[in-house]
C-alpha cells in the first residue's frame, strides 16, 4: 500500500515569495508522483515545479495559485493511487493602483459647494489600511469638511470649496508590506472670486501702418480687473498712453487696438487679469512689424533640350514667410504640366527650344512684395557657317583659318593642331567669331589644323590641311661682317631656299670679278689664300624663277688674328709689396687689352690709386692684400678676334727670418720682391 | 514657431522593415519639400530623398532606391520613410529636414539600430 | 551625381584666428550651395545659403563667398562655440548632394 510520510499543509505566503508544499511517500514498487490543483494536473514551469515529490514555488502568484492542491502517488504497475490531504495558500499581498473620481461621474461635473468623492485604488490581503494626503500633507479623518471612510477606501469632501483644490494621493498598508497610489488626482475648485482666463491673445502679424487688435478676457466674481502693459511696463489705458502709443485703444471687453503700428510699437503686450482674491494671470503676445527683405539675384541658367530641369527660387527673409510663385510671359505657371511649379521650384520637363526666355520668382508676404527674373537659355547643337578650308599661307606673313558656327548660347571654339590644344600666344589668336589667326606664318606652320565648336547641348568639327608658301630667304642670313685671318684659307658661306631650289652667287659689292685664288663653289664663297686685296664689300645673290632674286651684302675684314707676346705668370707677392702681371698682345687690327680680376672686368677709370694698367698692357697692383690674391685674366681683343690668358697672384705674409738663416737666404718660392 | 517632431529610437532585427515619421507644424505644410538625410556614426550627411507634401511626388536618391519609402498624411501634416530590407549599413540617425532658404528646420534626428 | 570635395577634412586652430573651408563642386552649382554646422550634440544648423547669404541669427564672422564650382565657407574670428563638423551642400541638381565635413577643433 501506498503511505505518505509527509503531507502538504495549508500555510500562509507572500506574493512574489518562495514557498514549498511537502509530499513525501513510501511504497512497495516504484510510484511516480503528481501535484493536481483544483483537480487538474499541474504541469511545470520556471515559477512552479515539481521538486521531488514537493511542489516548489519560485515565485508566489495570488491569481495562479489560489485554489487546492493535492499530491497524488500512483503505482503504474498495479494502477495503485493514493491522494493527500488538500492544501492551500493563504496568500498575502498589496498592490498599487490610481486615485479615480467616484462622484460626481466626471470633473466637469465638479462645481464648488457640491459634494466631491475620490476613491484609492489600492487592493490587498489582508485588508490594508488607507491614508490620504492633499499636495503631500496627510489628511485626518473629520478634518476641515471631509471624512474618510476606511472600509470604502472613500474619501469624501463635503461640500467641496476652493481651499480642497490640490493634488490628492492615498497610500496603504497591511501585514504584507506597504503601497502609494500609482496615479493621483488634481482637484481643481476654482474661487469664482479668482480671475481665470476666458481669451487669451495670441502673437500678430502687421504691415507697417495697418491696425492689430489683442484680444483678452478674464471673468470672475465680482468681475476681476484688466490691465494692460507694453514692454516697458508702461500701463496702457485709453487715459494715460505711453507717447510712443498715442494709437491705443483698450476696449471694455478687454481687448487692445492699435492703429497704424510702426516700428516702435513692436515688442511684447501683457494683460493682466485680478480678482478679488489669488494670484494676478499674466498673459503675454507679442506684436510683429511684417517685413520683406530683396531676393537673392540668379544666375542665368542655360539648358540642354530634352533634359529636365529645376530652378529653385529662394524665399526673402520676411515675416511672417513669404509665399513663392513663378511666373512666365506674365501667367502664374500651373501646378501641374510640362512646365509648372511645385513648391518654390520651377520645373521644365523635356526642355524645348520654345521654353527659353525670362521667368519671374515672385516672394510676397503681409509687408509686400518681391520678384526676380532668372534668364533661361535653351542650348543648341552649333551648326555650321564656314568650315575651316585646305589653305596655302605665305611664310611670314599673317594667316588665317575660318571656324565660323551658330547656335544657343553662342558657341565656344577651339583649336588643334596636329591634335594637340592651340593655347593662345604671341603667334596664335583665335577671334570672337573662331577664326584662327597665326600672326607670322613659319614653315613648320604646315599641318593638320581641327577646330571644335561646341555649346552644353553638343559640338561640332572640321579639319583642314595648311600648304606653307616658302618665301626666298636666306637660311642662315649671311653675318654682314666678317673676319678672315691673312694668308690663311678661309670660307664664306651662304645658303638659301624657297619654293623652288634658287641659284647663289657671289660677286663683289664694286661689280669687279673675283679674282682666280677666289672660287664661288655652290654658294661657298671660298680663298685659297687671304691676301690684304681680299678685304671688301661682297655680295651674295639667291635667285629662283617664280620668287626673283634676293641679297645680301657681307663686308669682309683681313686681319691678323691675336698672339701673345708676354703672358702673365705664376705670381706670389708678400703682402703690402706690389705686384706686376705683364701681357702683351700683338695683332692688326691692334688689339686692345683689358683685364678681369676675381671674376669682374677691371675697369680703368674705376681701378683707384692701387691698380694700374700701363699702355703695353701689364697691370700692377701696389701694396697688395690677401683678398687681391686669385686668377687674373688677361684679354686681348680686337675687331675679328678675341683670346684671353690668365695666371693666378698669391699674396702672403713676410716670414720672420730665423737666426741660422743669413741676411742673404734665398726665399722658398718665386718672389717679386720690391 | 516651426517645428519637425520626429519618432523615437529603433532597434530592429537585419532583414525586418521600419517606419519612421517626422510630424511638421507651424508652417504651410502642402507647398514644401520634406528631405530625409542619413548619417551614419562618426560619418557625413547622406541625401536619401524628398517628398512634395501637396501630392506625394517624391525624388530619391538612386543609391536609397527600393530601400526607403516616402510617404506622407496631410490630415496630421505628418511625413513618413520607410526602410526595408534591414542590415547594420542601415544602422545611422536620419534626420527630416525642410530646406527653402532661409526658412531652414531640421528634424532632432531617429536613431535606428539594426542588430540580432 | 555632383561631387563635393571638401577641404581639409579637419583642422585645429586657436581661438581668433581666421579660419576657411573650401567646398568644390565637379560641375557650376549657380551658387545653390549652402554651409551647415553640426555640434557634436548632433544637432544640424544653416549658416549660410545661395553660397553668401547669412542665414538669420548666425554670427556675422560666418561669411560665404565664391561662384561656379568653388565656394568657401570662412570664420572672421574663431570662438569657443564654433566647435563642431562643418559640411557644404549643393542644391543645384538632384540628388542633393554633401561635402566629406571638416570638423574643426579648437588647440
Known amino acids: 500500500a501506498i503511505v505518505f510520510i509527509k503531507q502538504p499543509s495549508s500555510q500562509d505566503a507572500l506574493q512574489g515569495r518562495r514557498a514549498l508544499l511537502r509530499c513525501e511517500v513510501e511504497a512497495p514498487g516504484p510510484v511516480h508522483v503528481y501535484w493536481l490543483l483544483d483537480g487538474a494536473p499541474v504541469q511545470d514551469t520556471e515559477r512552479r515545479f515539481a521538486q521531488g515529490s514537493s511542489l516548489s514555488f519560485a515565485a508566489v502568484d495570488r491569481l495562479q495559485d489560489s485554489g487546492t492542491f493535492q499530491c497524488v502517488a500512483r503505482d503504474d504497475v498495479t494502477g495503485e493511487e493514493a491522494r493527500s490531504a488538500n492544501a492551500s495558500f493563504n496568500i498575502k499581498w498589496i498592490e498599487a493602483g490610481p486615485v479615480v473620481l467616484k462622484h460626481p461621474a466626471s470633473e466637469a461635473e465638479i462645481q464648488p459647494q457640491t459634494q466631491v468623492t475620490l476613491r484609492c485604488h489600492i487592493d490587498g490581503h489582508p485588508r490594508p489600511t488607507y491614508q490620504w494626503f492633499r499636495d503631500g500633507t496627510p489628511l485626518s479623518d473629520g478634518q476641515s469638511n471631509h471624512t474618510v471612510s476606511s472600509k470604502e477606501r472613500n474619501l469624501t469632501l463635503r461640500p467641496a470649496g476652493p481651499e480642497h483644490s490640490g493634488l490628492y494621493s492615498c497610500c496603504a498598508h497591511s501585514a504584507f508590506g506597504q503601497a502609494c497610489s500609482s496615479q493621483n488626482f488634481t482637484l481643481s475648485i476654482a474661487d469664482e472670486s479668482f480671475a481665470r482666463v476666458v481669451l487669451a491673445p495670441q502673437d500678430v502679424v502687421v504691415a507697417r501702418y495697418e491696425e492689430a487688435m489683442f484680444h483678452c478676457q478674464f471673468s470672475a466674481q465680482p468681475p476681476p480687473s484688466l490691465q494692460w502693459l507694453f514692454e516697458d511696463e508702461t500701463p496702457i489705458t485709453n487715459r494715460s498712453r505711453p507717447p510712443h502709443l498715442r494709437r491705443a485703444t483698450v476696449f471694455a471687453n478687454g481687448s487692445l487696438l492699435l492703429t497704424q503700428v510702426r516700428p516702435r510699437n513692436a515688442g511684447i503686450y501683457r494683460c493682466i487679469g485680478q480678482g478679488q482674491r489669488g494670484p494676478p494671470i499674466i498673459l503675454e503676445a507679442t506684436l510683429h512689424l511684417a517685413e520683406i527683405e530683396d531676393m537673392p539675384l540668379f544666375e542665368p541658367r542655360v539648358f540642354t533640350a530634352g533634359s529636365e530641369e529645376r530652378v529653385t527660387c529662394l524665399p526673402p527673409k520676411g515675416l511672417p514667410e513669404p509665399s513663392v510663385w513663378w511666373e512666365h510671359a506674365g501667367v502664374r505657371l500651373p501646378t501641374h504640366g510640362r512646365v509648372y511649379q511645385k513648391g518654390h521650384e520651377l520645373v521644365l520637363a523635356n526642355i524645348a527650344e520654345s521654353d527659353a526666355g525670362v521667368y519671374t520668382c515672385h516672394a510676397a508676404n503681409l509687408a509686400g512684395q518681391r520678384r526676380q527674373d532668372v534668364n533661361i537659355t535653351v542650348a543648341t547643337v552649333p551648326s555650321w557657317l564656314k568650315k575651316p578650308q585646305d589653305s596655302q599661307l605665305e611664310e611670314g606673313k599673317p594667316g588665317y583659318l575660318d571656324c565660323l558656327t551658330q547656335a544657343t548660347p553662342k558657341p565656344t571654339v577651339v583649336w588643334y593642331r596636329n591634335q594637340m590644344l592651340i593655347s593662345e600666344d604671341s603667334r596664335f589668336e583665335v577671334f570672337k567669331n573662331g577664326t584662327l589667326r597665326i600672326n607670322s606664318v613659319e614653315v613648320y606652320d604646315g599641318t593638320w589644323y581641327r577646330c571644335m565648336s561646341s555649346t552644353p547641348a553638343g559640338s561640332i568639327e572640321a579639319q583642314a590641311r595648311v600648304q606653307v608658301l616658302e618665301k626666298l630667304k636666306f637660311t642662315p642670313p649671311p653675318q654682314p661682317q666678317q673676319c678672315m685671318e691673312f694668308d690663311k684659307e678661309a670660307t664664306v658661306p651662304c645658303s638659301a631656299t624657297g619654293r623652288e631650289k634658287p641659284t647663289i652667287k657671289w660677286e663683289r659689292a664694286d661689280g669687279s670679278s673675283l679674282p682666280e685664288w677666289v672660287t664661288d663653289n655652290a654658294g661657298t664663297l671660298h680663298f685659297a689664300r687671304v691676301t690684304r686685296d681680299d678685304a671688301g664689300n661682297y655680295t651674295c645673290i639667291a635667285s629662283n624663277g617664280p620668287q626673283g632674286q634676293i641679297r645680301a651684302h657681307v663686308q669682309l675684314t683681313v686681319a691678323v688674328f691675336i698672339t701673345f707676346k708676354v703672358e702673365p705668370e705664376r705670381t706670389t707677392v708678400y703682402q703690402g709689396h706690389t705686384a706686376l702681371l705683364q701681357c702683351e698682345a700683338q695683332g692688326d687690327p691692334k688689339p686692345l687689352i683689358q683685364w678681369k680680376g676675381k671674376d669682374r672686368i677691371l675697369d680703368p677709370t674705376k681701378l683707384g690709386p692701387r691698380m694700374h694698367i700701363f699702355q703695353n698692357g701689364s697691370l700692377v697692383i701696389h701694396d697688395v692684400a690677401p683678398e687681391d690674391s686669385g686668377r687674373y685674366t688677361c684679354i686681348a681683343g680686337n675687331s675679328c678676334n678675341i683670346k684671353h690668358t690668365e695666371a693666378p697672384l698669391y699674396v702672403v705674409d713676410k716670414p720672420v727670418p730665423e737666426e741660422s738663416e743669413g741676411p742673404g737666404s734665398p726665399p722658398p718660392y718665386k718672389m717679386i720682391q720690391t | 514657431q516651426v517645428q519637425l517632431q520626429q519618432s523615437g529610437p529603433e532597434l530592429v532585427k537585419p532583414g525586418a522593415s521600419v517606419k519612421i515619421s517626422c510630424k511638421a507644424s507651424?508652417?504651410?505644410?502642402?507647398?514644401?519639400?520634406m528631405n530625409w538625410v542619413k548619417q551614419r556614426p562618426g560619418k557625413g550627411l547622406e541625401w536619401i530623398g524628398r517628398i512634395y507634401l501637396g501630392d506625394g511626388d517624391t525624388n530619391y536618391n538612386g543609391k536609397f532606391t527600393g530601400k526607403a519609402t516616402l510617404t506622407a498624411d496631410k490630415s496630421s501634416s505628418t511625413v513618413y520613410m520607410q526602410l526595408s530590407s534591414l542590415t547594420s549599413e542601415d544602422s545611422a540617425v536620419y534626420f527630416c529636414?525642410?530646406?527653402?532658404?532661409?526658412?531652414?528646420?531640421w528634424g532632432q534626428g531617429t536613431t535606428l539600430t539594426v542588430s540580432s | 551625381d555632383i561631387q563635393m570635395t571638401q577641404t581639409p577634412s579637419s583642422l585645429s586652430a586657436s581661438l581668433g584666428d581666421r579660419v576657411t573651408i573650401n567646398c568644390r563642386a565637379s560641375?557650376?552649382?549657380?551658387?545653390?550651395l549652402n554651409w551647415y554646422q553640426q555640434k557634436p550634440d548632433g544637432t544640424v544648423k544653416l549658416l549660410i545659403y545661395?553660397?553668401?547669404i547669412l542665414h538669420s541669427g548666425v554670427p556675422s564672422r560666418f561669411t560665404g563667398s565664391g561662384s561656379g564650382t568653388d565656394y568657401s565657407l570662412t570664420i572672421s574670428t574663431l570662438e569657443q562655440e564654433d566647435i563642431g563638423t562643418y559640411f557644404c551642400?549643393?542644391?543645384?541638381?538632384?540628388?542633393?548632394?554633401f561635402g566629406g565635413g571638416t570638423k574643426l577643433e579648437i588647440k
Open positions: 551642400q549643393q542644391g543645384n541638381t538632384l540628388p542633393w548632394t
Open positions: 507651424g508652417y504651410p505644410f502642402s507647398t514644401s519639400w
Open positions: 529636414a525642410r530646406w527653402r532658404g532661409d526658412y531652414d528646420y
Open positions: 560641375q557650376g552649382l549657380s551658387n545653390y
Open positions: 545661395y553660397a553668401s
